[in-house]
Amino acid sequence: MAVTACQGLGFVVSLIGIAGIIAATCMDQWSTQDLYNNPVTAVFNYQGLWRSCVRESSGFTECRGYFTLLGLPAMLQAVRALMIVGIVLGAIGLLVSIFALKCIRIGSMEDSAKANMTLTSGIMFIVSGLCAIAGVSVFANMLVTNFWMSTANMYTGMGGMVQTVQTRYTFGAALFVGWVAGGLTLIGGVMMCIACRGLAPEETNYKAVSYHASGHSVAYKPGGFKASTGFGSNTKNKKIYDGGARTEDEVQSYPSKHDYV
């Protein structure tokens, strides 16, 4: 039951995380105008991965897409790539994990197959979360660098009468959404990996049992050792004796009322 809960919770947490990564990638507020130096500005600038926007005090907002690919900074391209890879891996992970969920029965899928799928989706979620965190962190680092560069420029060449206030950008809401979402996806992935360990049939059950037939022939069907690798287990070829050493999840190998929560 604990494994099912861990797997289910891991799935839900990852789902929220990936939704957040998608939201962050689409958001326009990756960087927002720093108003510290000019709090009275009537024009507010903010930028995303795909377009930059200007909101006037009238409420009128004008957004312009980055219609060039080659003219964009390499770092921005890298951030885009990381976020897209994160989304793609997360989406595939979600698809795999749906079929891996213990509470969902698909044909005669074995526990070991579900364990493999759970582990695969878990790893995908971890990588997805790391991609998102890396993407957001690279962008944040880029902002910090540009912020201090523009601050340095702001106080040079001001000998004349005319002041030119350079627009500086600071962290936008999308960065925080991305960090949280990436973290959730990572946590969900770890939970899936933990759940995978509980789902895999225990190796020791088979290795510890030795048989000494006394008189009558004991019904023994070979094939149980396949499970020791964790791949290609055949639960149809189960030993009649297994020393009673079953895990909590093996007890629920067959459909019961608990499987359809």
Epitope: V40, A42, V43, N45, C53, S57, S58, T167
Partner: antibody
């Protein structure tokens, strides 16, 4: 068509308050900022502040902070500008102007309200 | 506050003349986010409310004759009337639309020579 109709001329004594109204029609009242601009006799234009009729949020020029209050009544599509502690230099024509949607500039102006401050 | 300085304060010209009014701001009105200059030009006739002519430094308001044009960037702007018409004799104001308070220039009174 868009119309901004302001209240009539006022004569006030120094230290008193004046409340000028501006009734809007011909457009969605709650969608546009309303500005107040004044013009002293023979002088230039002076921006006083603005109010958003939907949220009621205001932005006043530092010069008028503490003396000016802008309010709105959405049921009658009217905005009000109240100026307190009147001085003789507050004698001016007060205009309300609708915020232009697409740029920051006001594009429709009221006919103006003459406020005379005299003892 | 941004100071707006208009020159000349008054100008005499004849019908058909080409007229240029300049406006200088104490701070740049160019927004880097969209590369637009937040400067507006108004025309005011005696006893009337101001009328919007040009916004974003060079965008003509609908219904404004093509003889009116705006140019400039950053801190220096100009309003040009290519061929003066009798109805163009009025006072012209530039306005900072970039930061609060939205300050106006002192005005340029255009009179008939």
């Amino acid at each position: 068509q868009v119309q901004l109709v302001q209240s009539g001329a006022e004569v006030k004594k120094p230290g008193a308050s004046v409340k000028v109204s501006c009734k809007a029609s011909g457009y969605t009242f709650t969608s546009y900022w309303m500005h107040w601009v004044r013009q002293a006799p023979g002088q230039g234009l002076e921006w006083m502040g603005m109010i958003h009729p939907n949220s009621g949020s205001t932005n006043y020029a530092q010069k008028f902070q503490g003396r000016v209050t802008m309010t709105r009544d959405t049921s009658t599509s009217t905005v009000y500008m109240e100026l307190s502690s009147l001085r003789s230099e507050d004698t001016a024509v007060y205009y309300c102007a609708r915020r232009y949607y697409g740029s920051i500039s006001p594009d429709y102006w009221g006919q103006g309200t003459t406020v005379t401050v005299s003892s | 506050d941004i100071q707006m300085t208009q020159s000349p304060s008054s100008l005499s010209a004849s019908v058909g003349d080409r007229v240029t009014i300049t406006c200088r701001s104490s701070q740049s009105l160019l927004n880097s986010g969209n590369q637009k200059n937040y400067l507006t030009w108004y025309q005011q006739k005696p006893g009337k409310a101001p009328k919007l002519l040009i916004y974003w430094a060079s965008t003509r308001e609908s219904g404004v004759p093509s003889r009116f044009s705006g140019s400039g960037s950053g801190t220096d702007f100009t309003l040009t009337i290519s061929s003066l018409q009798p109805e163009d004799f009025a006072t012209y104001y530039c306005q900072n639309d970039y930061s609060y308070p939205f300050t106006f220039g002192g005005g340029t009174k255009l009179e008939i020579k």
